[in-house]
C-alpha cells in the first residue's frame, strides 16, 4: 500500500536512576543505544497492524519504547494498556519525523503485558502493538569455569555452563604474590575462551554474566618456589575435571618432568607437556596432569618430579558433596573505644564460598583471601565502633554456614531519663554493663548524697537492640520522695555518669544531665 | 647419544600415500617438540608441522593441511608422518628435526628419508 | 605468512677471511619476552641440516665461536670471523615467531 508510513520501532534501556511507574513521554532519559524491534506487519489483521519484536526486561529496569513515524503531516495518537487509556505526545525529531514515546521505570510484574499504540495521521490510521514481558531470571545460572584440553592442540578451553550464556576471560599474571591482585598492573586479561600461553605464574578463567563473576585458578606446582610448610590440598566433586600444572625453570632444556599419582606414573593421556625459553636462555618445562572427570579413586597424592629439581606433591581429594568447614560457635569481643579490630572466619571450603557480613539488618560485602594452609579467611573491620550483634554467613552449591559474633565496646555509661506520674526510670547503654544508684537532694542532702534503697528496680539487660544490651533502673515514686529532686547514677569500670530528676507531677521533667569521670 | 633414525626411501605414484617414521633415543621422548621439514631437490627448506609427543598435539602448516598427518607412539618413541594425495611436487627429502621449545632451534636433525612421486 | 629474505645468495670466500650473511623478516621477530626467535642453519653438501644460532644470537652446543649472530625485529646478520674449509655449504635462516615456520632461501658458501 503506497500510503503506508515507513515505521520503526525501538527499544532503549536505561540507567536506572528514578523510580516511577509507566509514563508516556515525549522525551526520555538518557540512556544507552536504541535497539530495533523490527515493526512488521501483522498478517491476517483487521486493519494496519504492526507487531514488534517481543521485549524482555528485567525486574527493576528502565526502559522506553519508541516509535519514529516517517508521513507526511500532523500526528495524533493513544496508548492503550490493559484497557486503560495512557497520555501520549507525539513531537518530531530533527529528520521530521513523528516521534511516539513510552518509558516504563523501574520495571515490575504489573507493567507486563500488551502495550497498544493507535496512531492517526493525515493519510492512514494504524495500531502497533509491543509486547512487554518480565525476563524470568529463576532460570539464571552462574558456574564455576572449568577447563578442558582443546582437541589436538596444546591450548586449554574455559567453559562455564551459565544461563544466560557467560563471558569468559582469562586473568593472567607473571609476577609473584601480591602484585597478581585482579586491579594489577601485572594482571592482563584476555577475553576469549581459548588460552595458548599456559607458561604464566598466576592462570585463573572467570565467568560473568547478570548473576555476577565466577572464577578457577589453574592449580599450580611451582618447583622453583620454596614449598608451603603444609601440603597443598585441592578438593573436587566426584565427576569434576581435575587440572594440575607442574612448572619448573632451568638452565639448559635437559631436564625432564613427570606426574606420579600414590608413586604410580599418570597413565598416558593424563598428562602433556610443553615447554619454552624464558628469560636469560633459560627454559620453562610445564606438565599437565588431567582427569575429564574424577572418581573416588583419583584421591591422593600427586607428586610432581624433575631430574632437576627437588619433587613437589599435592594432596587431591575427591568428595561427593561440597563442604564448609570452620568453628560456628558464636564469640564475644569486648574492645575499646578506639582499638583497632577485626572480626575473622578461617574456614575451609568446597566448592568457594559466597559470603556476606550482617549487622542491624545491613549487609556488608565480604573478601575472602586463601592462606598456604589450605584454608581460607574472611575479616570484616568496618563496624565503625558500633557494638552488637554482627553475622557472618556463607553458602556454596551443597552447604551452609552461619557464625554470629557480639561486639561490646568499652565506654563510661551514658545516662537517658524518663518520668512518669508512678516512676522514674534511667537507661545507659555503657560497657561492662553498669550499676545503678539512686540519691535523693533534699535540704539535708544539697550534694545528693542520700541514698535511696527503697522501691528501686534494676534490670540488666533491658532490650536487646541488634545485640546492644541496654540496662535500666526504675524508682517507684513515694511520698517520701514526691517533689524531691533524684539523682540517678549509672557507674561502670570506666566511670560515672548521672541524670536528675524532678519528681513533682506528671508532664514534662527538667532533665540535668551530670557526667562524672 | 641423542639420535633421531628415519625409515627408508620410498616411491609412490601420484595419488597415493606415504608414512615416514623417525625413531628417537637417547634422550626423554615426551619433553621435546618434534617437526618436520622437508627439501626438494636443488631448493630450499620447508617446514611442514609440529607434534608434541606429550599429548600429541600438532600444528600443520597450512599447505598441507587436510594432506598432513602427524602422529606418536611413546611405547617406541617415535614419530610418523603421513602425507596423503601424493603428486610429483611432493618429490622430496623429508626431515624429522627436535625442537627445543616449541619456537624452532631445531638442535637435533634425522638423516632425511627421500621419498619419490612418479607415474 | 612471514616473508624470510637472504642476502647474498652466494657468498666466495678466502680461507681465513670474515664472512657475513644478511636475512630480513617481513615483520618483527621480536617476541614480546624480549627474544627475537631466529634461528640460523647450515647443511653441508650431502648432510642434513644443523643448529648454528638460536633466539638470533646464542650459540648452538658444540658450535665454533667463529659463528656469531646478531640483530632485532626484522634485520639480522650471521658472522664467520674466519672461515675454515669445512664451513662450506648453504646457510639458512629461519623464523621461529609464528607458525607457519619459513625458512630463507638459502645462502651458499664457498671457498674461492
Known amino acids: 500500500n503506497q500510503d503506508l508510513p515507513v515505521i520503526k520501532c525501538v527499544l532503549i534501556n536505561h540507567k536506572n536512576n528514578d523510580s516511577s511507574v509507566g509514563k508516556s513521554s515525549s522525551y526520555p532519559m538518557v540512556s544507552e543505544s536504541p535497539e530495533d524491534l523490527g515493526c512488521a506487519l501483522r498478517p491476517q489483521s483487521s486493519g494496519t497492524v504492526y507487531e514488534a519484536a517481543a521485549v524482555e526486561v528485567d525486574v527493576s529496569a528502565s526502559i522506553t519504547l519508541q516509535v519514529l513515524v516517517d508521513a507526511p503531516g500532523n500526528i495524533s495518537c493513544l496508548w492503550v494498556f490493559k484497557h486503560s487509556s495512557l497520555n501520549c505526545q507525539p513531537h518530531f525529531d530533527l529528520q521530521n519525523r513523528g516521534v511516539v514515546s513510552m518509558v516504563i521505570l523501574k520495571m515490575t510484574e504489573t507493567q507486563a503485558g500488551e502495550y497498544l499504540l493507535f496512531i492517526q495521521s493525515e493519510a492512514t490510521n494504524y495500531t502497533i502493538l509491543f509486547t512487554v514481558s518480565i525476563r524470568n531470571t529463576l532460570l539464571y545460572t552462574l558456574r564455576r569455569p572449568y577447563f578442558r584440553k582443546m582437541e589436538n592442540q596444546d591450548a586449554l578451553v574455559c567453559i562455564s555452563e551459565s544461563v544466560p550464556e557467560p563471558i569468559v576471560e582469562w586473568v593472567l599474571c607473571d609476577s609473584q604474590g601480591e602484585s597478581c591482585k585482579e586491579e594489577s598492573p601485572a594482571v592482563v586479561k584476555k577475553e576469549e575462551k581459548v588460552l595458548h600461553e599456559l607458561f604464566g605464574t598466576d592462570i585463573r578463567c572467570c565467568a560473568r554474566n547478570e548473576l555476577g563473576r565466577e572464577c578457577t585458578r589453574l592449580f599450580t606446582i611451582d618447583l622453583n618456589q620454596t614449598p608451603q610448610t603444609t601440603l597443598p590440598q585441592l578438593f573436587l566433586k566426584v565427576g569434576e575435571p581435575l587440572w594440575i600444572r607442574c612448572k619448573a625453570v632451568h638452565v639448559n632444556h635437559g631436564f625432564g618432568l613427570t606426574w606420579e599419582l600414590e608413586n604410580k606414573a599418570l597413565e598416558e593421556g593424563n598428562y602433556f607437556e610443553m615447554s619454552t625459553y624464558s628469560t636469560n636462555r633459560t627454559m620453562i618445562r610445564i606438565l599437565f596432569a588431567f582427569v575429564s572427570s574424577v572418581a573416588r579413586n583419583d584421591t591422593g597424592y600427586y607428586t610432581c618430579s624433575s631430574s632437576k629439581h627437588p619433587s613437589q606433591s599435592a594432596l587431591v581429594t575427591i568428595v561427593e558433596k561440597g563442604f564448609i568447614n570452620a568453628t560456628n560457635s558464636s564469640e564475644d569481643y569486648e574492645i575499646d573505644q578506639y582499638e583497632e579490630f577485626c572480626f575473622s572466619v578461617r574456614f575451609k571450603a568446597y566448592p568457594q564460598i559466597r559470603c556476606t557480613w550482617t549487622f542491624s539488618r545491613k549487609s556488608f560485602p565480604c573478601e575472602q583471601k586463601g592462606l598456604d594452609n589450605g584454608y581460607s579467611i574472611s575479616k570484616f573491620c568496618n563496624h565503625k565502633h558500633q557494638p552488637g550483634e554482627y553475622i557472618f554467613h556463607a553458602e556454596n552449591d551443597d552447604a551452609q554456614f552461619t557464625k554470629m559474633f557480639t561486639l561490646n565496646i568499652r565506654r563510661k555509661p551514658q545516662v537517658l531519663a524518663e518520668a512518669s506520674a508512678s516512676q522514674a526510670s534511667c537507661f545507659s547503654d555503657g560497657y561492662p554493663l553498669p550499676s545503678w544508684t539512686w540519691k535523693k537532694c533534699s535540704d539535708k542532702s544539697p550534694n545528693c548524697t542520700e541514698e535511696i534503697t527503697e522501691g528501686v528496680w534494676n534490670r540488666k539487660a533491658n532490650r536487646k537492640v541488634f545485640g546492644q544490651w541496654v540496662s535500666s533502673s526504675t524508682l517507684n515514686m513515694s511520698e517520701a520522695i514526691k517533689g524531691f529532686l533524684v539523682k540517678c547514677c549509672a557507674y561502670n569500670s570506666l566511670g560515672t555518669s548521672c541524670e536528675t530528676i524532678l519528681l513533682n507531677s506528671p508532664g514534662p521533667f527538667p532533665f540535668i544531665q551530670d557526667n562524672i569521670s | 647419544q641423542v639420535q633421531l633414525v628415519q625409515s627408508g626411501a620410498e616411491v609412490k605414484k601420484p595419488g597415493a600415500s606415504v608414512k615416514v617414521s623417525c625413531k628417537a633415543s637417547?634422550?626423554?621422548?615426551?619433553?621435546?617438540?618434534m617437526h618436520w621439514v622437508r627439501q626438494a631437490p636443488g631448493q630450499g627448506l620447508e617446514w611442514m608441522g609440529i607434534?608434541?609427543?606429550?599429548?600429541?598435539?600438532?600444528v600443520y602448516a597450512q599447505t598441507f593441511q587436510g594432506r598432513v598427518t602427524m602422529t606418536r607412539d611413546t611405547s617406541t618413541s617415535t614419530v610418523y608422518m603421513e602425507l596423503s594425495s601424493l603428486r610429483s611436487e611432493d618429490t622430496a627429502v623429508y626431515y624429522c628435526?627436535?625442537?627445543?621449545?616449541?619456537?624452532?632451534?631445531?638442535?637435533?636433525w634425522g638423516q632425511g628419508t627421500m621419498v619419490t612421486v612418479s607415474s | 605468512d612471514i616473508v624470510m629474505t637472504q642476502s647474498p645468495l652466494s657468498l666466495p670466500v678466502t680461507p681465513g677471511e670474515p664472512a657475513s650473511i644478511s636475512c630480513r623478516s617481513s615483520?618483527?621477530?621480536?617476541?614480546?619476552?624480549?627474544?627475537?626467535?631466529l634461528d640460523w642453519y647450515l647443511q653441508k653438501p650431502g648432510q642434513s641440516p644443523q643448529l648454528l644460532i638460536y633466539?638470533?644470537?646464542n650459540r648452538a652446543s658444540g658450535v665454533p665461536d667463529r659463528f656469531s649472530g646478531s640483530g632485532s625485529g626484522t634485520d639480522f646478520t650471521l658472522k664467520i670471523s674466519r672461515v675454515e674449509a669445512e664451513d662450506v655449504g648453504v646457510y639458512y635462516c629461519?623464523?621461529?615467531?609464528?607458525?607457519?615456520?619459513?625458512f630463507g632461501q638459502g645462502t651458499r658458501l664457498e671457498i674461492k
Open positions: 628435526a627436535r625442537g627445543i621449545g616449541s619456537k624452532g632451534a631445531f638442535d637435533i
Open positions: 637417547g634422550y626423554t621422548f615426551t619433553i621435546y617438540y
Open positions: 607434534i608434541n609427543p606429550s599429548g600429541g598435539s600438532t
Open positions: 615483520q618483527s621477530l621480536l617476541h614480546s619476552n624480549g627474544y627475537n626467535y
Open positions: 633466539l638470533g644470537s
Open positions: 629461519m623464523q621461529g615467531l609464528q607458525t607457519p615456520y619459513t
